[in-house]
Amino acid sequence: ATKLTEEKYELKEGQTLDVKCDYTLEKFASSQKAWQIIRDGEMPKTLACTERPSKNSHPVQVGRIILEDYHDHGLLRVRMVNLQVEDSGLYQCVIYQPPKEPHMLFDRIRLVVTKGFSGTPGSNENSTQNVYKIPPTTTKALCPLYTSPRTVTQAPPKSTADVSTPDSEINLTNVTDIIRVPVFN
């Protein structure tokens, strides 16, 4: 099995997480891609996905998440703007390839969002927090629902409330197309 690796990002409320997930260009360029959160003891939960087929450089926005799939570069860009403490968690990019199970892209992202000043080495205690606000949702792609025999034995997620972002303009609990896909071993 491939060793799962993580990159940790420590950010403050109001900042932007801006990451890329590389993929094999020839194989996955037009495949639908998704951004998921993995919470302890739960199955990955899809927060946003590209259109199907995925369009080149066409931004898809779900709440504070913006996905851009650059086919010609072989990368999916993920931005989470106006971060909230509640956004902290482990994230991953996946590629949908029905009827097979989604293909996970490396590396996973460990996001830690802190209120005010993070106090971590290398951070600036006197820097001001960004107060940038994004416009309301512009485009939302429907994410497919996958079922798998492997999910049967797993306990269902405790609640969807834990992805809520009460202080943001758009609450992720309002997104009706959040889906669950198998845990990757």
């Epitope: 990159e7 990002y9 950010l11 403050k12 900042q15 932007t16 801006d18 990451v19 890329k20 997930c21 590389d22 094999t24 260009l25 450089s57 913006i66 650059y70 570069h73 072989g74 990368l75 931005r79 703007v81 590396d107 992202i109 951070s123 600036n124 820097s127 960004n130 940038y132 606000k133 994004i134």
Partner: antibody
């Protein structure tokens, strides 16, 4: 420690091509994008494009499309930038730089020492 | 194409605070990095992710962002801080600001 060592200065005639190398050490070469940035005398930094050493895929700034080619030789952890149809205004210091992390495109934490390319007839 | 705008020059007296701005469309959605470049040398990363300092960068360097404007602040400016400073962001492509020459009087 991470190091990017570039090839030496070059003098070229207009219309010719130049190929600059950037040898990486101290990290897994395939894991991080390599960028090329140039700086004309007395001017600012100008991003030319990036190379994904893992796939060999590259992304070029619009200005250089059709004239620049970025490649790599993973066996010797070296990236290359070739610029063709040189003009006098291509005279500049050319830098290679490496992403800070595997999952980001910016910032560039490590830079080569620069290669001066002079285009003169 | 995406552009980042910086003032061409900023002057400051030793020990005073220097502020260099960088503005661009939707910069609030993007992470900003700052580089210092001294004559004849390669650029050095001094701030990333809007306000973080790489190890080895003095505490007098700080970064902030409000709306679509990022600011590099150098408090207690020293003669050795005289250099060119560039902001950077990632739009569809990577973009650098035009650069700001910091002069320590």
């Amino acid at each position: 420690q991470v190091q990017l060592v570039q090839s030496g200065a070059e003098v070229k005639k207009p219309g010719a091509s130049v190929k600059v190398s950037c040898k990486a050490s101290g990290y897994t070469f395939n894991g991080y994008y390599i960028h090329w940035v140039r700086q004309a005398p007395g001017q600012g930094l100008e991003w030319m494009g990036w190379l994904n050493p893992n796939s060999g895929g590259a992304n070029y700034a619009q200005k250089f499309q059709g004239r620049v080619t970025m490649t790599r030789d993973t066996s010797i952890s070296t990236a290359y930038m070739e610029l063709s149809r040189l003009r006098s205004d291509d005279t500049a210091v050319y830098y290679c730089a490496r992403d800070q992390r595997k999952t980001t495109v910016t910032p560039f934490e490590y830079w080569g020492q620069g290669t001066l390319v002079t285009v003169s007839s | 194409s995406y552009e980042l705008t910086q003032p061409p020059s900023v002057s400051v007296s030793p020990g005073q605070t220097a502020s260099i701005t960088c503005s661009g469309d939707k910069l609030g959605e993007r992470n900003v990095a700052w580089y210092q470049q001294k004559p004849g040398q390669s650029p050095v990363l001094v701030i990333y992710q809007d306000n973080k300092r790489p190890s080895g960068i003095p505490e007098r360097f700080s970064g902030s962002k409000s709306g679509n404007t990022a600011t590099l602040t150098i408090s207690g400016t020293q003669a050795m801080d005289e250099a060119d400073y560039y902001c950077q962001a990632w739009d569809r492509n990577v973009v650098f600001g035009g650069g700001t020459k910091l002069t320590v009087l």
